[in-house]
């Protein structure tokens, strides 16, 4: 009987040691979790504040809906304009609607006045079709008025509230467009 009691006591002591070990592990785990939580919260706060501080468009760009626009301060031919936009992570302006056209022409009136600005529209040499740089055709209301009788390459530009066409090798200002950053706040 004494042996039986002694065995039970030993078993209980072993159990107690295991529980103490488990408690120690749990405390350690809890401390680790708290540290991780702290790190996660700090990371989240940093991310949120940087997202809050970063504007949807870069400096000197104008926002309208989900687009950012940059109006150049230099003249260049159409190809150089396209390259300049690409290097900024954008492309020459692609006008999707009358609303966008109105916004652009309204903004230009406020910023610069009545100058010529290249957009991302060019005429296919073979078919004579007008195409945006992504290969899509402009909507019927946004086809350039035929102003260019040039035998050379013909590209589209905006002046006042009109879309016009000209030899791609003439010098004009240009407008770049890219997606605005989505604010996650």
């Amino acid at each position: 009987k004494l042996l039986q009691v002694s065995t039970i006591a030993m078993q209980q002591q072993e159990k107690l040691i295991q529980q103490e070990r488990a408690l120690l592990n749990f405390t350690e785990w809890k401390r680790s979790c708290a540290l991780q939580m702290k790190y996660c919260q700090a990371f989240m706060q940093n991310s949120l504040s940087s997202a809050h501080n970063s504007s949807p468009c870069p400096n000197n760009w104008i926002q309208n809906r989900e687009s950012c626009y940059y109006v150049s301060e230099i003249w260049s031919i159409w190809h150089t304009s396209q390259e300049n936009c690409l290097k900024e992570g954008s492309t020459l302006l692609q006008i999707e609607s009358k609303e966008e056209m109105d916004f652009i022409t309204g903004s230009l009136r406020k910023i610069k006045g009545s100058y010529d600005y290249w957009v991302g529209l060019s005429q296919d040499g073979h078919s004579g079709r007008w195409l945006w740089q992504d290969g899509s055709s402009p909507s019927p209301g946004l086809l350039p008025a035929e102003r260019s009788q040039s035998a050379n390459q013909v590209c589209g530009y905006v002046k006042s509230n009109s879309l016009l066409s000209s030899n791609c090798s003439t010098w004009k200002y240009f407008i770049c467009e890219k997606y605005a950053l989505r604010s996650s706040v």
């Epitope: 159409w78 190809h79 396209q82 390259e83 690409l86 290097k87 900024e88 992570g89 954008s90 492309t91 060019s122 296919d124 040499g125 195409l131 740089q133 992504d134 290969g135 390459q153 590209c155 791609c168």
Partner: nanobody, 115 residues
Framework: QVQLVESGGGLVQPGGSLRLSCAAS????????MGWYRQAPGKERELVAR???????NYADSVEGRFTISRDKDENTVYLEMNTLKPEDTAVYYC?????????WGQGTQVTVSS
């Protein structure tokens, strides 16, 4: 990463022809401009010709009417057909590509026009 590999350079007599090729591989944005610059010894690098993803070309005045740029959009390859070559066309010809936030250059191919 984008890689540009040029080929087709060589020695040719004045009045002769050459066809340069430049193959682009890697992740290329759908809207881009590809083209050719050249650099003669002791001179600055100058634009020769370029072409958009939709095939709209543009030429330097010195080569207009003699050189023709074209591209195979599916193969991401740009070609420069050079006719009526002159000694002043002698240079290293570099292929380049401008994509979104990126500009890439090939290693260059030597073109020598001499009798």
């Amino acid at each position: 990463q984008v890689q540009l590999v040029e080929s087709g350079g060589g020695l040719v007599q004045p009045g002769g022809s050459l066809r340069l090729s430049c193959a682009a591989s890697g992740s290329i944005s759908s809207i881009n401009v590809m083209g050719w610059y050249r650099q003669a010894p002791g001179k600055e690098r100058e634009l020769v010709a370029r072409i958009t993803n939709l095939g709209l070309p543009n030429y330097a005045d010195s080569v207009e009417g003699r050189f023709t740029i074209s591209r195979d959009k599916d193969e991401n390859t740009v070609y420069l057909e050079m006719n009526t070559l002159k000694p002043e066309d002698t240079a290293v010809y570099y292929c380049y590509l401008v994509g979104l936030k990126a500009e890439y250059w090939g290693q260059g191919t030597q073109v020598t026009v001499s009798s």
